[in-house]
Interface confidence: medium
């Protein structure tokens, strides 16, 4: 399987909410011996590998924001901690998963990465990630609502195993 990032750039005004999205592509095993761990973190565009650096989102680590479930089950973070920081991650039955960030500030600007770890019990794990940029703007040049820019088809599937 791969991870697609439908949008590579989100440009939002300060104070707005935004939902960053990733999507699982390809066959997803729904058997009992497979679970998925999905999470989010901030990163920087490394020279070697984008998303290799894991930085917290609003002081919350990727462990704090993760979802852990089987196949295409739906899930969302029940962490009070995340919600207190204006964050919520969620996953649906169709392979989409997202993080919603409320009341954006300029400090939220940066590169965001989604990470999916497929754990095949008794065997191994397979990791893929996707990256997208969030730009939070203020002043007269800021849009009134979030504007999203689609990834090129090459970008959205150019995903490297972590």
């Amino acid at each position: 399987f791969k991870v697609a990032t439908p949008y590579s750039l989100y440009v939002c005004p300060e104070g707005q909410n935004v939902t960053l999205t990733c999507r699982l592509l390809g066959p997803v095993d729904k058997g009992h011996d497979v679970t998925f761990y999905k999470t989010w973190y901030r990163s920087s565009r490394g020279e070697v590998q984008t998303c290799s650096e894991r930085r917290p989102i609003r002081n919350l680590t990727f462990q704090d924001l993760h979802l852990h479930h089987g196949g295409h089950q739906a899930a969302n973070t029940s962490h009070d901690l995340a919600q207190r920081h204006g964050l919520e991650s969620a996953s649906d039955h169709h392979g989409n998963f997202s993080i919603t960030m409320r009341n954006l500030t300029l400090l939220d600007s940066g590169l965001y990465c989604c990470l999916v770890v497929e754990i095949r019990h008794h065997h191994s794990e397979h990791r893929v990630h996707g990256a997208m940029e969030l730009q939070v703007q203020t002043g007269k040049d800021a849009p009134s609502n979030c504007v999203v820019y689609p990834s090129s088809s090459q970008d959205s599937e150019n995903i490297t195993a972590a």
């Epitope: 679970t35 761990y37 990163s43 490394g46 070697v48 590998q49 290799s52 650096e53 894991r54 930085r55 680590t61 462990q63 704090d64 852990h68 029940s78 901690l81 770890v117 754990i119 019990h121 794990e125 972590a162």
Partner: antibody, heavy 116, light 107 residues
């Protein structure tokens, strides 16, 4: 084959800095997190901290003010530094590579005694 | 920090007995709990992860269950080689935390 080996002085004086190295092989340093865990003699396991892929760190607040975990990719080594040690820091220190999202592959551990 | 409270701290059982060790988390950790076995003088070895999945090579007599805050490790038929200390660990959030351990002996 994943291998980790801790090394460093077996004896450290109180108030000095404990410095340990974890030399790894069989995997890429840039792809996995490494935790340091310790076990005082006859006691339980205590997680010290982690260095994530890309070099970010997260430390147990019990050690926060005196611990540093770093990586030297050119030498395939991770290091742990713990300053201002006391006798309570006497323990077997383990480095462990994550897999399945938890510490999975452990080194053999190295005993560090803090004594004058 | 999440506290992991293990019980009992020690127990003695006979070969063939069914043995149960419990672990209680101070807050919800989902199924992000592992169990390790540590034999005297040896490195901890992973037995169970994701609360109920046996790691590769672990005998089928070991099983794990639970979610949320209450977790159990069960040895269905105790063998002499199972003498060890067993630790639960949560990896739901940092800092990773371990239970204080359960020392298992043979009667």
């Amino acid at each position: 084959q994943v291998q980790l080996q801790e090394s460093g002085p077996g004896l450290v004086k109180p108030s000095e800095t404990l410095s340990l190295t974890c030399t790894v092989s069989g995997f890429s340093l840039t792809n996995y997190d490494i935790s340091w865990i310790r076990q005082p003699p006859g006691k339980g396991l205590e997680w010290i901290g982690v260095i994530w892929t890309g070099g970010g760190t997260n430390y147990n607040s019990a050690f926060m003010s005196r611990v540093t975990i770093s990586v030297d990719t050119s030498k395939n080594q991770f290091s742990l530094k713990l300053s201002s040690v006391t006798a309570a820091d006497t323990a077997v220190y383990y480095c462990a590579r994550e897999g399945l999202l938890l510490p999975l592959y452990w080194g053999q551990g190295t005993l560090v005694t803090v004594s004058s | 920090d999440i506290q992991m409270t293990q019980s009992p701290s020690s127990l003695s059982a006979s070969v063939g007995d069914r043995v149960t060790i419990t672990c209680k988390a101070s807050q919800n950790v989902g199924t992000n709990v592992a169990w390790y076995q540590q034999k005297p003088g040896k490195v901890p070895k992973l037995l169970i992860y994701s609360a109920s999945y046996r790691y590769s090579g672990v005998p089928s007599r070991f099983s794990g269950s639970g979610s949320g805050t209450d977790f159990t490790l069960t040895i269905s038929s105790l063998q002499p080689e199972d003498v060890a200390t067993y630790y639960c660990q949560q990896y739901n959030s940092y800092p990773l935390t371990f239970g204080q351990g359960t020392k298992l002996e043979i009667k």
